[in-house]
Protein backbone atom coordinates (compact mmCIF):
# COMPACT_ATOMS: atom_id res chain seq x y z
CA UNK A 1 0.00 0.00 0.00
CA UNK A 2 1.06 3.58 -0.60
CA UNK A 3 0.59 6.36 1.92
CA UNK A 4 -2.43 7.60 0.04
CA UNK A 5 -4.14 4.24 0.09
CA UNK A 6 -3.29 3.76 3.74
CA UNK A 7 -4.99 7.08 4.48
CA UNK A 8 -8.01 6.14 2.43
CA UNK A 9 -9.48 3.50 4.70
CA UNK A 10 -12.57 3.28 6.86
CA UNK A 11 -11.54 3.33 10.54
CA UNK A 12 -14.95 2.15 11.73
CA UNK A 13 -15.52 -0.65 9.23
CA UNK A 14 -12.90 -2.91 7.73
CA UNK A 15 -15.51 -4.63 5.56
CA UNK A 16 -15.33 -1.83 3.00
CA UNK A 17 -13.64 -0.93 -0.25
CA UNK A 18 -12.29 2.64 -0.27
CA UNK A 19 -10.87 4.90 -2.94
CA UNK A 20 -9.93 8.59 -2.98
CA UNK A 21 -12.18 9.44 -5.93
CA UNK A 22 -14.87 11.42 -4.14
CA UNK A 23 -15.33 15.17 -4.65
CA UNK A 24 -11.97 16.91 -4.32
CA UNK A 25 -10.20 13.59 -3.80
CA UNK A 26 -12.24 12.72 -0.75
CA UNK A 27 -11.90 9.17 0.45
CA UNK A 28 -15.11 7.30 -0.26
CA UNK A 29 -15.84 3.88 1.21
CA UNK A 30 -18.46 1.37 0.16
CA UNK A 31 -19.66 -1.60 2.16
CA UNK A 32 -18.84 -5.02 0.76
CA UNK A 33 -21.89 -6.94 -0.36
CA UNK A 34 -24.16 -3.92 -0.84
CA UNK A 35 -21.80 -1.40 -2.43
CA UNK A 36 -23.48 1.30 -0.35
CA UNK A 37 -21.48 4.36 0.67
CA UNK A 38 -20.77 4.39 4.40
CA UNK A 39 -19.98 7.20 6.81
CA UNK A 40 -16.63 6.23 8.31
CA UNK A 41 -16.88 8.77 11.11
CA UNK A 42 -19.46 6.60 12.87
CA UNK A 43 -20.55 2.97 13.18
CA UNK A 44 -21.88 1.24 10.09
CA UNK A 45 -25.41 -0.10 10.40
CA UNK A 46 -25.81 -3.73 11.44
CA UNK A 47 -27.76 -4.45 8.26
CA UNK A 48 -24.87 -3.46 5.99
CA UNK A 49 -22.41 -5.33 8.21
CA UNK A 50 -24.48 -8.51 8.07
CA UNK A 51 -24.77 -8.16 4.32
CA UNK A 52 -20.99 -7.86 4.06
CA UNK A 53 -20.60 -10.91 6.28
CA UNK A 54 -23.16 -13.08 4.49
CA UNK A 55 -20.55 -15.62 3.46
CA UNK A 56 -19.41 -16.18 7.05
CA UNK A 57 -20.34 -19.50 8.73
CA UNK A 58 -23.74 -19.82 10.32
CA UNK A 59 -23.71 -19.02 14.00
CA UNK A 60 -26.93 -20.30 15.56
CA UNK A 61 -27.62 -19.95 19.26
CA UNK A 62 -30.42 -20.90 21.62
CA UNK A 63 -30.83 -18.51 24.48
CA UNK A 64 -32.92 -18.33 27.63
CA UNK A 65 -35.35 -15.42 27.50
CA UNK A 66 -35.43 -12.94 30.38
CA UNK A 67 -39.08 -12.01 29.70
CA UNK A 68 -41.92 -13.29 27.57
CA UNK A 69 -41.47 -10.63 24.91
CA UNK A 70 -37.66 -10.66 24.67
CA UNK A 71 -36.16 -11.84 21.41
CA UNK A 72 -32.90 -13.61 20.81
CA UNK A 73 -31.06 -14.10 17.56
CA UNK A 74 -31.68 -17.80 17.08
CA UNK A 75 -31.61 -17.66 13.29
CA UNK A 76 -27.95 -16.75 13.00
CA UNK A 77 -26.59 -15.16 9.86
CA UNK A 78 -28.67 -14.34 6.82
CA UNK A 79 -28.25 -12.05 3.83
CA UNK A 80 -30.55 -9.14 4.72
CA UNK A 81 -32.31 -6.56 2.59
CA UNK A 82 -31.30 -3.06 3.66
CA UNK A 83 -33.07 0.19 2.81
CA UNK A 84 -31.26 3.16 1.20
CA UNK A 85 -30.24 4.38 4.67
CA UNK A 86 -28.74 1.00 5.52
CA UNK A 87 -31.52 -0.01 7.92
CA UNK A 88 -33.15 -3.42 7.86
CA UNK A 89 -36.24 -3.64 5.69
CA UNK A 90 -39.20 -4.73 7.83
CA UNK A 91 -39.75 -7.81 5.68
CA UNK A 92 -36.92 -10.20 4.94
CA UNK A 93 -37.13 -13.13 2.53
CA UNK A 94 -34.72 -15.88 1.53
CA UNK A 95 -34.09 -17.33 -1.92
CA UNK A 96 -36.87 -19.89 -1.48
CA UNK A 97 -39.51 -17.15 -0.95
CA UNK A 98 -39.79 -17.78 2.78
CA UNK A 99 -40.41 -14.42 4.45
CA UNK A 100 -40.54 -13.02 7.99
CA UNK A 101 -40.68 -9.68 9.78
CA UNK A 102 -37.71 -8.29 11.67
CA UNK A 103 -37.11 -5.54 14.20
CA UNK A 104 -34.61 -2.68 13.86
CA UNK A 105 -31.72 -4.97 14.83
CA UNK A 106 -32.67 -7.52 12.17
CA UNK A 107 -33.94 -10.19 14.55
CA UNK A 108 -37.01 -12.14 13.44
CA UNK A 109 -40.16 -11.13 15.33
CA UNK A 110 -42.83 -13.20 13.55
CA UNK A 111 -43.32 -16.73 12.34
CA UNK A 112 -41.97 -17.43 8.88
CA UNK A 113 -44.46 -17.16 6.04
CA UNK A 114 -44.56 -16.82 2.27
CA UNK A 115 -44.39 -13.82 -0.06
CA UNK A 116 -47.88 -12.74 1.01
CA UNK A 117 -46.60 -11.94 4.52
CA UNK A 118 -46.99 -8.26 5.35
CA UNK A 119 -44.70 -6.32 7.66
CA UNK A 120 -46.27 -2.89 7.93
CA UNK A 121 -43.43 -1.09 9.73
CA UNK A 122 -39.97 -1.63 11.04
CA UNK A 123 -40.51 -2.09 14.77
CA UNK A 124 -37.86 -0.43 16.90
CA UNK A 125 -35.81 -2.40 19.40
CA UNK A 126 -35.72 0.07 22.28
CA UNK A 127 -34.13 -2.06 25.00
CA UNK A 128 -31.15 -4.37 24.66
CA UNK A 129 -29.86 -6.51 27.49
CA UNK A 130 -26.31 -7.77 27.03
CA UNK A 131 -25.66 -10.65 29.38
CA UNK A 132 -22.00 -11.57 29.89
CA UNK A 133 -20.22 -14.14 32.00
CA UNK A 134 -16.58 -13.38 32.72
CA UNK A 135 -13.85 -15.93 33.28
CA UNK A 136 -12.92 -16.65 36.89
CA UNK A 137 -10.70 -14.05 38.53
CA UNK A 138 -8.93 -13.86 41.89
CA UNK A 139 -11.79 -11.78 43.25
CA UNK A 140 -14.90 -9.98 42.09
CA UNK A 141 -14.48 -6.74 40.17
CA UNK A 142 -15.42 -3.55 41.96
CA UNK A 143 -18.91 -2.77 40.69
CA UNK A 144 -18.41 0.97 40.29
CA UNK A 145 -15.08 0.48 38.48
CA UNK A 146 -16.69 -2.07 36.16
CA UNK A 147 -19.64 0.25 35.56
CA UNK A 148 -17.32 3.17 34.72
CA UNK A 149 -15.14 1.10 32.39
CA UNK A 150 -18.07 -0.31 30.40
CA UNK A 151 -19.69 3.12 30.10
CA UNK A 152 -16.36 4.53 28.92
CA UNK A 153 -16.08 1.73 26.36
CA UNK A 154 -19.52 2.41 24.87
CA UNK A 155 -18.88 6.15 24.85
CA UNK A 156 -15.37 6.14 23.38
CA UNK A 157 -15.13 3.03 21.23
CA UNK A 158 -18.69 2.86 19.94
CA UNK A 159 -19.52 6.59 20.27
CA UNK A 160 -22.81 5.79 21.98
CA UNK A 161 -24.18 8.71 23.99
CA UNK A 162 -23.88 7.91 27.73
CA UNK A 163 -27.60 8.50 28.30
CA UNK A 164 -28.35 5.34 26.29
CA UNK A 165 -26.41 3.10 28.68
CA UNK A 166 -29.24 2.71 31.18
CA UNK A 167 -27.50 0.45 33.71
CA UNK A 168 -24.64 -1.94 34.38
CA UNK A 169 -25.48 -4.79 36.77
CA UNK A 170 -22.95 -7.14 38.30
CA UNK A 171 -23.28 -10.35 40.25
CA UNK A 172 -20.07 -12.27 39.84
CA UNK A 173 -19.50 -13.76 37.29
CA UNK A 174 -22.50 -12.25 35.44
CA UNK A 175 -22.43 -8.74 34.00
CA UNK A 176 -25.52 -7.21 32.43
CA UNK A 177 -25.42 -4.06 30.30
CA UNK A 178 -28.75 -2.41 29.60
CA UNK A 179 -29.06 -0.18 26.57
CA UNK A 180 -32.25 1.86 26.14
CA UNK A 181 -33.13 4.15 23.25
CA UNK A 182 -36.69 5.08 22.30
CA UNK A 183 -37.52 6.47 18.87
CA UNK A 184 -38.21 9.86 20.44
CA UNK A 185 -34.82 9.90 22.23
CA UNK A 186 -32.66 9.16 19.17
CA UNK A 187 -31.52 12.38 17.54
CA UNK A 188 -29.92 12.71 14.10
CA UNK A 189 -26.30 11.59 14.34
CA UNK A 190 -26.85 9.44 17.43
CA UNK A 191 -25.38 5.94 17.22
CA UNK A 192 -28.12 3.30 17.33
CA UNK A 193 -28.03 0.96 20.34
CA UNK A 194 -28.45 -2.00 17.98
CA UNK A 195 -25.34 -1.06 16.04
CA UNK A 196 -23.33 -0.43 19.22
CA UNK A 197 -24.44 -3.80 20.64
CA UNK A 198 -23.44 -5.57 17.41
CA UNK A 199 -19.97 -3.98 17.36
CA UNK A 200 -19.57 -4.94 21.04
CA UNK A 201 -20.69 -8.50 20.34
CA UNK A 202 -18.15 -8.84 17.52
CA UNK A 203 -15.42 -7.29 19.69
CA UNK A 204 -16.14 -9.72 22.53
CA UNK A 205 -15.82 -12.63 20.07
CA UNK A 206 -12.45 -11.34 18.90
CA UNK A 207 -13.88 -10.35 15.49
CA UNK A 208 -13.40 -6.59 15.66
CA UNK A 209 -14.99 -4.59 12.86
CA UNK A 210 -12.66 -1.63 13.34
CA UNK A 211 -9.92 -1.07 10.79
CA UNK A 212 -6.40 -1.68 12.02
CA UNK A 213 -7.25 -1.24 15.70
CA UNK A 214 -6.15 -3.98 18.04
CA UNK A 215 -8.84 -6.27 19.38
CA UNK A 216 -10.82 -5.28 22.44
CA UNK A 217 -8.63 -5.22 25.53
CA UNK A 218 -11.07 -4.75 28.41
CA UNK A 219 -9.43 -4.02 31.75
CA UNK A 220 -10.90 -2.96 35.06
CA UNK A 221 -8.23 -1.27 37.19
CA UNK A 222 -5.60 -3.11 35.14
CA UNK A 223 -7.25 -6.50 35.63
CA UNK A 224 -8.24 -8.15 32.29
CA UNK A 225 -11.96 -8.73 31.85
CA UNK A 226 -12.25 -11.88 29.76
CA UNK A 227 -15.72 -12.86 28.63
CA UNK A 228 -16.50 -16.55 28.22
CA UNK A 229 -20.07 -16.26 27.01
CA UNK A 230 -22.43 -13.58 25.72
CA UNK A 231 -26.22 -13.58 25.44
CA UNK A 232 -28.09 -10.63 23.96
CA UNK A 233 -31.81 -10.06 24.47
CA UNK A 234 -33.81 -7.62 22.40
CA UNK A 235 -37.04 -5.93 23.50
CA UNK A 236 -39.16 -4.17 20.91
CA UNK A 237 -41.49 -1.19 21.29
CA UNK A 238 -44.27 -3.47 20.04
CA UNK A 239 -44.24 -7.09 21.33
CA UNK A 240 -43.38 -9.76 18.72
CA UNK A 241 -46.09 -11.85 17.03
CA UNK A 242 -45.34 -15.54 17.26
CA UNK A 243 -47.86 -18.37 17.12
CA UNK A 244 -48.70 -20.25 20.33
CA UNK A 245 -46.92 -23.28 18.90
CA UNK A 246 -43.57 -21.47 19.05
CA UNK A 247 -44.26 -19.94 22.46
CA UNK A 248 -44.91 -23.34 24.03
CA UNK A 249 -42.07 -25.08 22.23
Amino acid sequence: HTAAQDNCTCPTNKMTVCSPDGPGGRCQCRALGSGMAVDCSTLTSKCLLLKARMSAPKNARTLVRPSEHALVDNDGLYDPDCDPEGRFKARQCNQTSVCWCVNSVGVRRTDKGDLSLRCDELVRTHHILIDLRHRPTAGAFNHSDLDAELRRLFRERYRLHPKFVAAVHYEQPTIQIELRQNTSQKAAGDVDIGDAAYYFERDIKGESLFQGRGGLDLRVRGEPLQVERTLIYYLDEIPPKFSMKRLTA
Partner: antibody, heavy 116, light 107 residues
Framework: QVQLQQSGPEVVKPGASVKMSCKAS????????INWVKQRTGQGLEWIGQ????????HYNKNFKGKATLTADKSSNTAYMQLNSLTSEDSAVYFC?????????WGQGTLVTVSA | DIKMTQSPSSMYAFLGERVTITCTAS??????LSWFQLKPGKSPKSLIY???RLVDGVPSRFSGSGSGQDYSLTISSLDYEDMGIYYC?????????FGGGTKLELK
Protein backbone atom coordinates in the same frame (compact mmCIF):
# COMPACT_ATOMS: atom_id res chain seq x y z
CA GLN B 1 8.22 16.29 -3.99
CA VAL B 2 4.87 16.44 -5.81
CA GLN B 3 5.09 18.20 -9.18
CA LEU B 4 2.60 18.73 -11.99
CA GLN B 5 4.19 19.95 -15.23
CA GLN B 6 1.69 21.30 -17.74
CA SER B 7 2.22 21.68 -21.48
CA GLY B 8 3.02 25.03 -23.06
CA PRO B 9 0.72 27.79 -24.36
CA GLU B 10 -1.54 27.14 -27.33
CA VAL B 11 -2.91 29.51 -29.98
CA VAL B 12 -5.75 27.89 -31.87
CA LYS B 13 -8.38 28.88 -34.38
CA PRO B 14 -12.12 28.98 -33.56
CA GLY B 15 -13.79 25.62 -34.12
CA ALA B 16 -10.54 23.70 -33.66
CA SER B 17 -9.57 21.39 -30.78
CA VAL B 18 -6.68 21.43 -28.36
CA LYS B 19 -5.22 18.74 -26.13
CA MET B 20 -3.11 19.78 -23.14
CA SER B 21 -1.12 17.59 -20.78
CA CYS B 22 -0.30 17.45 -17.08
CA LYS B 23 2.68 15.22 -16.21
CA ALA B 24 2.79 14.08 -12.60
CA SER B 25 5.91 13.20 -10.62
CA UNK B 26 6.91 12.67 -7.01
CA UNK B 27 3.99 10.39 -6.13
CA UNK B 28 2.13 7.34 -7.39
CA UNK B 29 -0.10 8.61 -10.18
CA UNK B 30 -2.89 6.06 -9.70
CA UNK B 31 -3.43 6.97 -6.04
CA UNK B 32 -4.86 10.48 -6.45
CA UNK B 33 -7.46 12.32 -8.50
CA ILE B 34 -6.54 15.04 -10.97
CA ASN B 35 -8.90 18.01 -11.26
CA TRP B 36 -8.98 20.60 -14.01
CA VAL B 37 -9.83 24.26 -13.38
CA LYS B 38 -10.43 27.16 -15.77
CA GLN B 39 -9.44 30.78 -15.13
CA ARG B 40 -10.51 33.43 -17.61
CA THR B 41 -8.77 36.80 -17.52
CA GLY B 42 -10.33 39.01 -14.87
CA GLN B 43 -12.73 36.26 -13.84
CA GLY B 44 -12.89 33.63 -11.13
CA LEU B 45 -12.04 29.93 -11.04
CA GLU B 46 -14.35 27.35 -12.60
CA TRP B 47 -14.15 23.61 -11.98
CA ILE B 48 -14.16 21.55 -15.18
CA GLY B 49 -13.92 17.98 -13.95
CA GLN B 50 -12.04 15.27 -12.12
CA UNK B 51 -10.42 12.01 -13.21
CA UNK B 52 -9.16 9.18 -11.00
CA UNK B 53 -6.40 7.33 -12.88
CA UNK B 54 -6.67 4.42 -10.43
CA UNK B 55 -9.97 3.32 -11.95
CA UNK B 56 -10.44 5.73 -14.87
CA UNK B 57 -13.56 7.09 -13.20
CA UNK B 58 -14.41 10.72 -13.85
CA HIS B 59 -16.88 13.49 -13.08
CA TYR B 60 -17.62 16.54 -15.21
CA ASN B 61 -19.16 19.91 -14.56
CA LYS B 62 -22.28 19.82 -16.71
CA ASN B 63 -21.21 23.14 -18.28
CA PHE B 64 -18.21 21.34 -19.80
CA LYS B 65 -19.86 18.13 -20.98
CA GLY B 66 -19.15 17.84 -24.68
CA LYS B 67 -16.57 20.60 -24.40
CA ALA B 68 -13.90 18.86 -22.29
CA THR B 69 -12.68 15.26 -22.37
CA LEU B 70 -10.44 14.02 -19.56
CA THR B 71 -8.11 11.06 -19.97
CA ALA B 72 -5.11 9.62 -18.15
CA ASP B 73 -2.15 7.56 -19.35
CA LYS B 74 -0.85 5.45 -16.48
CA SER B 75 2.29 4.40 -18.37
CA SER B 76 3.53 8.01 -18.62
CA ASN B 77 1.92 9.37 -15.43
CA THR B 78 0.17 12.00 -17.52
CA ALA B 79 -3.35 13.40 -17.44
CA TYR B 80 -4.82 15.04 -20.52
CA MET B 81 -7.66 17.41 -21.25
CA GLN B 82 -9.00 17.91 -24.74
CA LEU B 83 -11.19 20.92 -25.51
CA ASN B 84 -13.38 20.79 -28.62
CA SER B 85 -15.16 23.32 -30.86
CA LEU B 86 -13.20 26.20 -29.40
CA THR B 87 -14.61 29.71 -29.23
CA SER B 88 -13.29 32.96 -27.74
CA GLU B 89 -15.05 31.97 -24.48
CA ASP B 90 -12.53 29.15 -24.16
CA SER B 91 -9.57 31.54 -24.07
CA ALA B 92 -8.25 31.03 -20.55
CA VAL B 93 -5.57 29.55 -18.35
CA TYR B 94 -6.28 25.90 -17.51
CA PHE B 95 -4.82 24.39 -14.37
CA CYS B 96 -4.51 20.77 -13.40
CA UNK B 97 -4.37 19.96 -9.68
CA UNK B 98 -3.80 16.79 -7.70
CA UNK B 99 -6.34 16.57 -4.89
CA UNK B 100 -6.58 14.44 -1.77
CA UNK B 101 -9.19 15.24 0.88
CA UNK B 102 -9.40 18.82 -0.42
CA UNK B 103 -5.66 19.44 -0.28
CA UNK B 104 -4.38 20.44 -3.72
CA UNK B 105 -1.04 20.60 -5.53
CA TRP B 106 -1.31 22.71 -8.67
CA GLY B 107 0.32 22.73 -12.06
CA GLN B 108 1.63 26.04 -13.47
CA GLY B 109 -1.25 26.35 -15.94
CA THR B 110 -1.63 26.22 -19.72
CA LEU B 111 -2.69 29.38 -21.53
CA VAL B 112 -5.07 28.75 -24.43
CA THR B 113 -5.77 31.62 -26.82
CA VAL B 114 -8.53 31.20 -29.38
CA SER B 115 -7.95 33.62 -32.22
CA ALA B 116 -8.80 33.77 -35.90
CA ASP C 1 -25.29 22.78 -7.58
CA ILE C 2 -23.98 24.32 -4.37
CA LYS C 3 -23.51 28.07 -4.69
CA MET C 4 -20.60 29.63 -2.80
CA THR C 5 -21.02 33.30 -1.91
CA GLN C 6 -17.76 34.96 -0.96
CA SER C 7 -17.40 38.37 0.66
CA PRO C 8 -16.09 40.95 0.35
CA SER C 9 -15.29 40.84 -3.37
CA SER C 10 -12.38 43.21 -2.75
CA MET C 11 -10.78 44.87 0.25
CA TYR C 12 -7.92 47.13 1.27
CA ALA C 13 -5.97 46.54 4.47
CA PHE C 14 -2.88 47.82 6.29
CA LEU C 15 0.21 45.72 6.94
CA GLY C 16 -0.17 44.02 10.34
CA GLU C 17 -3.96 44.30 10.20
CA ARG C 18 -6.24 41.33 10.96
CA VAL C 19 -8.21 40.34 7.86
CA THR C 20 -11.23 38.04 7.59
CA ILE C 21 -12.83 36.73 4.39
CA THR C 22 -16.08 34.77 4.52
CA CYS C 23 -17.73 32.14 2.36
CA THR C 24 -21.35 31.05 2.64
CA ALA C 25 -22.62 27.87 0.99
CA SER C 26 -26.20 27.52 -0.25
CA UNK C 27 -26.46 24.37 1.90
CA UNK C 28 -24.40 22.64 4.61
CA UNK C 29 -21.08 21.32 3.28
CA UNK C 30 -19.84 19.35 6.30
CA UNK C 31 -16.53 21.28 6.59
CA UNK C 32 -15.50 20.15 3.09
CA LEU C 33 -14.05 23.55 2.24
CA SER C 34 -10.63 24.68 1.01
CA TRP C 35 -9.03 28.12 0.66
CA PHE C 36 -6.60 29.10 -2.10
CA GLN C 37 -4.46 32.14 -2.85
CA LEU C 38 -3.92 33.25 -6.44
CA LYS C 39 -1.33 35.76 -7.63
CA PRO C 40 -1.01 37.12 -11.18
CA GLY C 41 0.92 34.78 -13.46
CA LYS C 42 1.23 32.10 -10.81
CA SER C 43 -0.62 28.90 -10.03
CA PRO C 44 -3.04 28.78 -7.09
CA LYS C 45 -1.57 28.00 -3.69
CA SER C 46 -3.46 25.80 -1.21
CA LEU C 47 -3.76 27.37 2.24
CA ILE C 48 -6.46 25.53 4.18
CA TYR C 49 -8.38 22.31 3.63
CA UNK C 50 -11.20 20.60 5.55
CA UNK C 51 -12.26 24.11 6.71
CA UNK C 52 -9.56 24.51 9.36
CA ARG C 53 -6.49 22.41 8.53
CA LEU C 54 -3.40 24.40 7.63
CA VAL C 55 -1.43 23.13 4.64
CA ASP C 56 2.20 22.27 5.47
CA GLY C 57 4.49 25.23 4.83
CA VAL C 58 1.74 27.85 5.03
CA PRO C 59 2.46 30.54 7.66
CA SER C 60 0.56 30.16 10.93
CA ARG C 61 -0.97 33.64 10.54
CA PHE C 62 -3.48 31.94 8.22
CA SER C 63 -6.36 30.11 9.86
CA GLY C 64 -9.72 28.72 8.79
CA SER C 65 -12.91 28.23 10.76
CA GLY C 66 -16.61 27.61 10.38
CA SER C 67 -19.16 24.85 10.05
CA GLY C 68 -22.46 24.10 8.35
CA GLN C 69 -22.88 26.77 5.67
CA ASP C 70 -20.63 29.55 6.99
CA TYR C 71 -16.84 29.57 6.80
CA SER C 72 -14.06 32.12 7.12
CA LEU C 73 -10.37 32.62 6.39
CA THR C 74 -8.45 34.85 8.78
CA ILE C 75 -5.00 36.40 8.36
CA SER C 76 -3.99 37.44 11.88
CA SER C 77 -1.36 40.00 10.82
CA LEU C 78 -1.23 40.99 7.18
CA ASP C 79 2.11 40.65 5.40
CA TYR C 80 3.12 42.23 2.09
CA GLU C 81 3.29 38.81 0.40
CA ASP C 82 -0.36 38.11 1.29
CA MET C 83 -1.66 40.39 -1.46
CA GLY C 84 -3.60 38.48 -4.10
CA ILE C 85 -6.99 36.94 -4.78
CA TYR C 86 -8.43 34.39 -2.33
CA TYR C 87 -10.92 31.72 -3.29
CA CYS C 88 -12.93 29.20 -1.30
CA UNK C 89 -13.88 25.85 -2.79
CA UNK C 90 -16.53 23.39 -1.62
CA UNK C 91 -15.90 19.72 -2.22
CA UNK C 92 -18.85 18.28 -0.34
CA UNK C 93 -20.42 17.16 -3.59
CA UNK C 94 -20.00 17.25 -7.35
CA UNK C 95 -19.75 19.62 -9.11
CA UNK C 96 -17.04 21.33 -7.08
CA UNK C 97 -17.79 25.06 -6.86
CA PHE C 98 -15.61 28.06 -6.08
CA GLY C 99 -16.53 31.31 -4.41
CA GLY C 100 -16.32 34.44 -6.54
CA GLY C 101 -12.98 35.48 -5.05
CA THR C 102 -11.75 38.26 -2.76
CA LYS C 103 -9.10 40.65 -4.06
CA LEU C 104 -6.88 41.74 -1.18
CA GLU C 105 -4.85 44.92 -1.71
CA LEU C 106 -2.62 47.09 0.43
CA LYS C 107 -4.10 50.28 1.89
Amino acid sequence: QVQLQQSGPEVVKPGASVKMSCKASGYRFTDYVINWVKQRTGQGLEWIGQIYPGSDSFHYNKNFKGKATLTADKSSNTAYMQLNSLTSEDSAVYFCARFFEGLAYWGQGTLVTVSA
Amino acid sequence: DIKMTQSPSSMYAFLGERVTITCTASQGINNYLSWFQLKPGKSPKSLIYRANRLVDGVPSRFSGSGSGQDYSLTISSLDYEDMGIYYCLQYDEFPLTFGGGTKLELK
